[in-house]
Each structure stands twice: as structure tokens, then as C-alpha cells.
Interface confidence: medium
């Protein structure tokens, strides 16, 4: 019946204008949760994380015109209040109480006890079969408007089936009887008498049956799909494969960049042997005594045996301290130790394949031309 | 403070049905309250019939349930008893009375008698 | 079904007197349990709830007592207004059920 406007309303009405509807409510960061255990205590705690390290204390009363008491039987977490079980004592009676730190009131309010009913779970559960159904009772609880909820399944079914009842008298028909059946009943409180925030009791232990004989369990049970575990791995692994795609083309676009705003200088000594220590830089001869044929290699340790080169007219590219880079800490590794960085289109591990006038070199970053 | 207010046929024909209604006023019918019927026969004790919670949910005594039913009217602020094939051993004061929550009978209409006789 | 009994189903006594009348559930009922007056064209009227606490306006000769089976409803001095029927009625459990009730008439 929704949310009981006019049951709420009128009990909004008695506690003088104070309800606040669900089973928590907040001021100063105190959030309150109460449970009425089968009428008999009822447990009230509280999650004040502005007060975790304080021992809150409880007082209460049955009765508006009453003194307060303070609570006699706290919970403790961590070693700090955070609860208080009570004997009720009576059953349908609001609860009038106050939280406080030493002597100022951290949160007060009042409540109908009942709202927030838990039921005992069911005793004596008993099965009595006959043909391809069960009649599953248990002993009804001494107090009305509840709901006995039984669920089965077999292995062959993918969830639990339910059937319930405002009795603890269920019977079950269209079973199966060569199939092995689990069962576990609960009790409800009925939401159109209690509200909507009563809490259901504890499943009582499951018990598995077939041919009419108890089981120790049924073997064949399959677990049950998780498809939203499945799921979830299948999107992890989606956005880390994006991710990983995003990052080598982020680099390899910074590459390109870098490329184009800092173009690669050829090492003279290096791409052209002889150059120098033959022809003392002169282009013409060099070209005439090597015959048009240039030569394509690059020392392994080609940089670190040469000593640093003087730019012998311009020097077109900035020292690599100062160039920008954005690498992730793997690239960064790989440079450091002499290590290329390798990139699908590069065809050659030494460097850039570069023509000129009609003649191809090999070309790395340290290279420069010349002009 | 509650009140409440008993109406219907003071004689009904054996097996017929028994209609009575209890207005309920100086309170709220929707209140955390059930709204009971009880009936005493001459001379006899108190004999729990049944009760309604304003949202429709019964309770009846077996020894008279497939005989009874009780409805409530919140837009009347009323509840009824009917009570269907009557005999003479249905003769008596029927009284409505308001129950708390799991509780006691805490308030009570005066009566009236209902007398089953052809 | 839980049965109530009460005695005993007549007393007499006089006014001034103590009185006692028991009632004994067939079942434990813990405390819920309720003491009624009833006086001859009357409705019952609430006298003690939960075995032993007196309700608003109800005079303080009257106490209950008992848990489990067995109560008490006791009058310390009876008063001429005391004279009519007495019941017990259990609330533990569905159906709800009184006792057969205790006529306390002057001797």
C-alpha cells in the first residue's frame, strides 16, 4: 500500500510533527537504524561518523510523560558505544529517545517500535509430501498479519521459486518427484499492517528433498550464471585495451610532431665515411671517389665513438635535453639504454630512411646536414 | 477521546445475515489501532469475534470465520460486522471496541442486541 | 487455541474485603493478559493491561499479578462500586479469547 501516507500521517500526527520516514534518519551526521527482534528486544544503533571516536550514550522511554533511562546494555565497535538493545516493554508502544555526547543531544526522535519488526525465523519446519506435492509448515509465531514465505528450486532451475502464505501451512504442487528439490522458508511482516520498513526474518536452514526423502543436498546443483561478474570483466577488459590504444597512439602522434617541429639531422661522420678523414669535407670529391654509391650502415656504437661534432655551418637541431617530451616511464627506460623506441611504420632500426638529391641515408636523432 | 457507536437490526430471521456498523468518531480510523467485535450472549461471557486494520487486514475467530466478514468505510470513518446464516445461539449484545496495536481493548461502543427469532 | 479459565465463577464477599480471582492460561501467554469490569447493561470497562500495570483512572486497590499461566487480579478493600463481572482476556495470540468471567456479589 506505498508507503502508508495516512498510517504515516497519523503517526506523524502523535509524535507531535517528529517522523522521518525510512529507517534512518540524520542530524549532525548520525544516522539511526532500528530493529524490533519478533517484539521481544528491540535494537537501536546509530553511524556518527562525526562523533567515531566518542561514547555516545542512549536514553529512552516507553512513555511520553516518563523520565528518560539510560541504556544498561550497550553494543560497542571499536571500543566506542554505537548501540543499545532494549527489552521492550510493550509491544505496540513508541519509542521516545535521545542520543547524546555527555550532556547535549546529538540526535532525539520518536518512533512506533513496530515499524521495524523482525520476525524470528521458523521453528519446527516440517515437510509432509504426497505425490508431486509438498505441504511445508512450521510453528505460526504468537503474533498476526505475517506472511510465511517458502522458496525451492531444483538444479534444473536458474532461480528461486516462492510461494507464500499468512499461515505457516504451504503447499507446493507440479513438483517433480524424481527431481531433488532445495527448500528455506522466512517470515514477512505484512506491509499494509507494519509498514514498509520492517525488515524479513532470517531464512531458516535449507533443506533438500527428493523421491519424498530428505538429502544431504542436491549434488547437482549447478552455481548459479554471474553474468554481471562476466560482464564486468568483459568492459574492464574493453576500456584498458581502449586505453592501451589510446596511449601508443598518443605517443606515436607525438612522434610525428616531434618529427616535424625538430627534423632529424644526418652525422656527417657517420652516414658518410671518409668525408672527412679523406677528402677534409669536400662534397664533390667525396661523391666522385665513392663512385655514387652511399653507403648504408650504422655502427652499433657509432655516436659514442665519435667525439662531439662542431656544426660546421648551421646547426639546425637543439640538444635533445632540451627537446620536449612526453614518455611514459617504459619509453623513457628504453631510451636511456640505448634503445630504440620502435613504432610499426619505422622501417629500420637504426633511423630514418631519408633521400636526398636522389641519394638515400640512414638517419637518427643525433644526425645533422651540413649546408 | 475515541468514541464509538454501535447500529443495525435489533432482530434478524434465522438464517439470514446479521449487519451491523460502528461509527467511530473523536479519533482516527486510521490510527495504529484494530477495530474489533466481541459479543456477549445473555448471561453469558465475552466472546471475541474478529478485527479489521483500516487498510483491510482481518482476523477472525475459526470457531466463527466462514461466517464472517468485517469491512471498513475510511471515507465514513466506520466499520461493519456481517454475520451470515444466523441461528438462535447468534442472539446477544454485540459490541464494536477499539484494540491498540497487540494490545488490549481500550475503548468500547455500548451495545446493542441483536436477537435472532423468526 | 488457547484457553482461558478463570476462578472462581461466583464470591462473595462484603465490603471492606480483600479479594482475589485467578485466571490460568492453558498455554503461557507471558504477560499479555488484560483485566476487565463489566457491570450488568454496561460494556466492559479496562481495569489492568499486561498482566500488572493499571490503566489511567483505574482506583490503585486494583493490581494484577502473575506471568507464564497463572494471574491475579487483585482488589485490596472492596468498595460497593466494586460489585459486578470480572474478566480475563489474553492478547498473546490469535484468537484472542477471555475467560468465563467472576461475578463478585455481596455476601
Known amino acids: 500500500m506505498g508507503r502508508l501516507v495516512l498510517l504515516w500521517g497519523a503517526a506523524v500526527f502523535l509524535l507531535g510533527g517528529w517522523m522521518a520516514l525510512g529507517q534512518g534518519g540524520a542530524a549532525e551526521g548520525v544516522q539511526i537504524q532500528i530493529i524490533y527482534f519478533n517484539l521481544e528486544t528491540v535494537q537501536v544503533t546509530w553511524n556518527a561518523s562525526k562523533y567515531s571516536r566518542t561514547n555516545l550514550t542512549f536514553h529512552y522511554r516507553f512513555n511520553g510523560d516518563e523520565a528518560y533511562d539510560q541504556c544498561t546494555n550497550y553494543l560497542l565497535q571499536e571500543g566506542h558505544t554505537s548501540g543499545c538493545l532494549l527489552d521492550a516493554e510493550q509491544r505496540d508502544d513508541i519509542l521516545y529517545f535521545s542520543i547524546r555526547n555527555g550532556t547535549h543531544p546529538v540526535f532525539t526522535a520518536s518512533r512506533w517500535m513496530v515499524y521495524y519488526l523482525k520476525p524470528s525465523s521458523p521453528k519446527h519446519v516440517r515437510f509432509s509430501w504426497h505425490q508431486d506435492a509438498v505441504t511445508v509448515t512450521c510453528s505460526d509465531l504468537s503474533y498476526g498479519d505475517l506472511l510465511y514465505e517458502v522458496q525451492y528450486r531444483s538444479p534444473f532451475d536458474t532461480e528461486w521459486q516462492s510461494k507464500q502464505e499468512n499461515t505457516c501451512n504451504v503447499t507446493i504442487e507440479g513438483l517433480d518427484a524424481e527431481k531433488c528439490y532445495s527448500f528455506w522458508v522466512r517470515v514477512k511482516a505484512m506491509e499494509d499492517v507494519y509498514g514498509p520498513d520492517t525488515y524479513p526474518s532470517d531464512w531458516s536452514e535449507v533443506t533438500c528433498w527428493q523421491r519424498g526423502e530428505i538429502r544431504d543436498a542436491c549434488a547437482e546443483t549447478p552455481t548459479p550464471p554471474k553474468p554481471k561478474l562476466s560482464k564486468f570483466i568483459l568492459i574492464s577488459s574493453l576500456a584498458i585495451l581502449l586505453m592501451v590504444s589510446l596511449l601508443l597512439l598518443s605517443l606515436w602522434k607525438l612522434w610525428r610532431v616531434k618529427k616535424f617541429l625538430i627534423p632529424s639531422v644526418p652525422d656527417p661522420k657517420s652516414i658518410f665515411p671518409g668525408l672527412f678523414e679523406i677528402h677534409q669535407g669536400n662534397f664533390q670529391e667525396w661523391i666522385t671517389d665513392t663512385q655514387n654509391v652511399a653507403h648504408l650502415h650504422k655502427m652499433a656504437g657509432a655516436e659514442q665513438e665519435s667525439g662531439p661534432e662542431e656544426p660546421l655551418v648551421v646547426q639546425l637541431a637543439k640538444t635533445e635535453a632540451e627537446s620536449p617530451r612526453m614518455l611514459d616511464p617504459q619509453t623513457e627506460e628504453k631510451e636511456a639504454s640505448g634503445g630504440s623506441l620502435q613504432l610499426p611504420h619505422q622501417p629500420l632500426q637504426g633511423g630514418d630512411v631519408v633521400t636526398i638529391g636522389g641519394f638515400t641515408f640512414v638517419m637518427n636523432d643525433r644526425s645533422y646536414v651540413a649546408l | 477521546q475515541v468514541q464509538l457507536q454501535e447500529s443495525g437490526p435489533g432482530l434478524v430471521k434465522p438464517s439470514g445475515t446479521l449487519s451491523l456498523t460502528c461509527a467511530v468518531s473523536g479519533g482516527s480510523i486510521n490510527s495504529n489501532n484494530w477495530w474489533s467485535w466481541v459479543r456477549q450472549p445473555p448471561g453469558k461471557g465475552l466472546e471475541w469475534i474478529g478485527d479489521?486494520?483500516?487498510?483491510?487486514?482481518?482476523n477472525y475467530n475459526p470457531s466463527l470465520k466462514s461466517r464472517v466478514t468485517i469491512s471498513v468505510d475510511k471515507s465514513k470513518s466506520q466499520f461493519s460486522l456481517k454475520l451470515s446464516s444466523v441461528t438462535a445461539a447468534d442472539t446477544a449484545v454485540y459490541y464494536c471496541?477499539?484494540?491498540?496495536?497487540?494490545?488490549?481493548?481500550?475503548?468500547w461502543g455500548q451495545g446493542t442486541l441483536v436477537t435472532v427469532s423468526s | 487455541d488457547i484457553q482461558m479459565t478463570q476462578s472462581p465463577s461466583t464470591l462473595s464477599a462484603s465490603v471492606g474485603d480483600r479479594v482475589t480471582i485467578t485466571c490460568r492460561a492453558s498455554?503461557?501467554?507471558?504477560?499479555?493478559l488484560a483485566w476487565y469490569q463489566q457491570k450488568p447493561g454496561k460494556a466492559p470497562k479496562l481495569l489492568i493491561y499486561k498482566a500488572s500495570s493499571l490503566e489511567s483512572g483505574v482506583p490503585s486497590r486494583f493490581s494484577g499479578s502473575g506471568s507464564g499461566t497463572e494471574f491475579t487480579l487483585a482488589i485490596s478493600s472492596l468498595q460497593p462500586d466494586d460489585f459486578a463481572t470480572y474478566y480475563c482476556?489474553?492478547?498473546?495470540?490469535?484468537?484472542?479469547?477471555f475467560g468465563g468471567g467472576t461475578k463478585v456479589e455481596i455476601k
Open positions: 471496541a477499539r484494540r491498540r496495536w497487540l494490545q488490549h481493548f481500550d475503548f
Open positions: 479489521i486494520y483500516h487498510s483491510g487486514s482481518t
Open positions: 482476556q489474553q492478547y498473546n495470540i490469535y484468537p484472542l479469547a
Open positions: 498455554q503461557s501467554i507471558t504477560n499479555w
